[in-house]
């Protein structure tokens, strides 16, 4: 019997076609992605093959203005009209608290919702009861499959999902969620879930009765064969794990935001067995035309958007200095006001020994693309955000060592002077450069922000310390030649839009007023 | 769990036809496709051939096309084999098995004999 | 058709030997093989799919490798109850086929 098995990751609000880089789509005869395109070759591949399931492993939340403005409701909208057979719940679903996800999302979806290692306690649990399953059991011609959902247990240091719900670990929860199926005689079993390509290869090979597994969080780009964009693959596809009990069992992802629609054959036997398994993912490129009725629905929702970006979203009543005379040279109070939103944004109280999980933040001065002025009544809006940061990025968390820190620093100054994008703009850092010594060499002092302490203060760096800091994705992926912290990350978790970040803390503090305050000297 | 329940064993002249059935229960019938396999005394096994129980489409061996037909009553979960023109050689263990033969029927013996 | 080759035809091994049968197909099979183990007068049985997984209650000293054309079944510790006829099956293209067979014996 064969399953086709479509799926989606980490689509982050690209409801509309994007450039190749899933950035804004400048030229249309190139851009790539969108719902409506991926319609099309779905209905295509539904037409064409009898058993076939559209699933989501989750964040399809939080990435663009669609999101900021319509909060899930469009999610809900686009992946009903798509009719997605499943969802696994994503970190970034709980980016607005449970209340924006069960309003927007789960009530309003006509599909299944998942995750078995999120329970939900207190008065919650009867509020959310029904409205997000462990497991579905969906009929697919002749046969039923079962899907089950797993979930990121670090939710609570990178989202907001409140006190009333426990992530537990994904193995120890999936396992007697399995067992169940198997019991109802339900012997074809997908791994639907948000944790990461590690987690699902470890859920393939840990989970006993898992058949297929179906990531994301991890952005991974598998492929066999000669890939037909930019992304290389971290793999072949479908990546075969040999389970503990010596089954293979193919684990998928489809990179990220829509660009590619995944695509995996499964042959079962009679048994559930998985007797093989091939695919690649598909690029959503030009040659696939958009679907007209997802389009014009698209292009309704969209007018919203074009209002909101106009809009007020609070007041500075200083000069915002956003200028590459500043920011690549010196500490910019820009700089500062956007290191204090990335802060502020990921402020997670989950241990009374801990005021934060994390203090810091860097940023590439060359990311700062426009000033604000003032003078315009102080009034700052998403179109002035959107020139000050165009590219679509994300504020992510990740975990170095100190002394991958204090390269990236000495690299932040090694050819100072030349205007060049790597200088760092810090918060929750002060440190010292002295620019006559020799390149490499340049850092005198760096000095943190503690985050196990109930009064924060600064302390020298650690070489051998672990340290959580919040950066943009560029950076992270060895942007401006910070190829050490690609190299020598301890983890890497996505992060929220950096417009959504920054628009988020202005609207919370109703009027700003960043200062030079020492920070970097 | 999947179960393979086949007719009985038959003896059968030279030249005559023998038809075996096997009655499948424990998996969704219509998904899948049935395998026959023979067993010569002392010998391998040989695939024959296999039907898919949802339309009755067939793939037979070259060796036994035009002597060989399967057929499927999909309101009995049954499969038929029918061999025509039996011959001395003909007489084996005749074993019904699932789409990737994971699960195997417990064999029909067929004597042609005159 | 595909030929499927297997050797030993037969060997004669004792309890706790490392046994290896090898199948050789005629042209790329790619993972479509099958281990089945028949024991006399009882129908075969599926110890091994798709090259290398094993099938559900089957003891894990029996493995299966290979790819292309070359594929064998090991058996880590030969048991009492492994004494048996193997046969490879491929179903990669139709006329499916057997390899000749290759009887453990105890030596």
């Known amino acids: 019997w064969e399953l086709t098995i479509l799926h989606t990751n980490d689509v982050h609000s690209r409801l509309e076609q994007t450039s190749e880089d899933s950035s804004k789509c400048v030229n249309a005869s190139r851009c790539m992605g969108g719902v409506a395109r991926l319609f099309t070759k779905v209905q295509q591949i539904r037409r064409a093959e009898p058993n076939v399931l559209l699933l989501d492993a989750g964040d399809q939340y939080q990435g663009t203005i669609w999101f900021t403005v319509y909060k899930g409701a469009e999610v809900a909208h686009f992946m009903n009209a798509l009719r997605y057979d499943a969802m696994a719940l994503g970190n970034h679903e709980f980016d607005n608290g449970v209340e924006g996800l069960i309003e927007p999302l789960l009530k309003e979806a006509k599909f299944p919702i998942l995750s078995a290692n999120i329970k939900a306690k207190g008065p919650l649990a009867s509020q959310i009861s029904g409205l997000y399953l462990p497991y579905k059991v969906l009929p697919v011609g002749d046969e039923v499959v079962g899907i089950v959902g797993y979930t990121s247990k670090e939710t609570p240091f990178l989202s907001n999902p409140g006190t009333n719900l426990v992530f537990e670990d994904e193995i120890t929860a999936l396992q007697p969620e399995v067992d169940k199926l198997k019991t109802l005689n339900v012997n074809k079993i997908i791994a639907l879930g948000h944790s990461g390509f590690e987690m699902d290869k470890l859920i393939a090979q840990k989970v006993r009765g898992v058949d297929v597994v179906v990531g994301g969080h991890s952005n991974t780009f598998l492929y066999t064969g000669n890939p037909p964009s930019k992304e290389v693959p971290a793999g072949k596809y479908p990546f075969i794990v040999t389970s503990d009990d010596g089954r293979k069992v193919p684990v998928v992802q489809a990179y990220a935001f829509g660009k590619y629609l995944g695509y995996l054959k499964i042959e079962f036997d009679e048994r559930g067995n998985v007797i093989s398994s091939h695919g690649n993912p598909i690029l959503l490129n030009s040659s696939i035309p958009e679907d007209p009725s997802i389009k014009a629905d698209i292009n309704k929702w969209r007018i919203k958007l074009d209002n909101y970006s106009t809009q007020e979203l609070g007041k500075t009543i200083v000069y915002l200095d956003g200028s590459s005379q500043s920011c690549r040279f010196r500490e910019c109070n820009m700089g500062n006001l956007i290191c204090d939103a990335m802060i502020n944004n990921n402020l997670r109280h989950t241990d009374e020994m801990f005021w934060n999980h994390v203090s810091m933040c860097i940023l590439n001065g060359g990311g700062i693309r426009s000033p604000i002025d003032e003078r315009n009544n102080g009034t700052i809006t998403w179109e002035n955000l959107a020139a000050v940061l165009p590219f679509g990025g994300t504020f992510d968390l990740v975990q170095l060592k100190g002394s991958t820190l204090k390269k990236a620093f000495e690299h932040s100054v090694h050819r100072y002077g030349q205007s060049t994008g790597e200088f760092l703009q810090v918060g929750g850092i002060h440190v010292v450069y002295d620019l006559s010594r020799k390149p490499g060499d340049r850092v005198v002092k760096l000095d943190v922000l503690c985050t196990k302490c109930r009064v924060p203060s600064y302390d020298p760096l650690k070489m051998d310390e672990v340290y959580k800091v919040i950066l943009p994705n560029f950076l992270a992926n060895g942007g401006d030649g910070f190829q050490m912290i690609k190299d020598e990350l301890l983890r890497h978790d996505s992060g929220d839009q950096d417009i959504n970040v920054v628009s988020t803390y202005i609207s919370k503090m109703k009027v700003i007023y960043p200062a030079v305050e020492g920070r970097i000297k | 769990e999947v179960q393979l329940v086949q007719s009985g064993a038959e003896v059968k002249k030279p030249g005559a036809s023998v038809k075996v059935s096997c009655k499948a229960s424990g998996y969704t019938f219509t998904a899948y496709f049935m395998n026959w396999v023979r067993q010569a005394p002392g010998q391998g096994l040989e695939w024959m051939g296999r039907i898919y129980h949802n339309n009755g489409d067939t793939f037979y061996s070259q060796k036994f096309k035009g002597r060989v037909t399967m057929t499927v009553d999909k309101s009995t979960s049954t499969v038929y084999m029918e061999l025509s023109s039996l011959r001395s050689e003909d007489t084996a263990v005749y074993y019904c098995?699932?789409?990737?033969?994971?699960?195997w029927g417990q064999g029909t013996t067929v004597t042609v004999s005159s | 058709d595909i030929q499927m080759t297997q050797s030993p035809s037969s060997l004669s091994a004792s309890v706790g030997d490392r046994v290896t049968i090898t199948c050789r197909a005629s042209q790329d099979i790619g993972d479509s093989l099958n281990w089945l183990q028949q024991k006399p007068g009882k129908a075969p049985k599926r110890l091994i799919y798709a090259t290398s997984s094993l099938d559900s209650g089957v003891p894990s000293r029996f493995s299966g490798s290979g790819s292309g054309t070359e594929y064998t079944l090991t058996i880590s510790s030969l048991q009492p109850e492994d004494f048996a006829t193997y046969y490879c099956?491929?179903?990669?293209?139709?006329?499916?086929?057997f390899g000749g067979g290759t009887k453990v014996e105890i030596k």
């Open positions: 098995a699932t789409s990737y033969v994971g699960d």
């Open positions: 099956l491929q179903y990669a293209s139709f006329p499916w086929t």
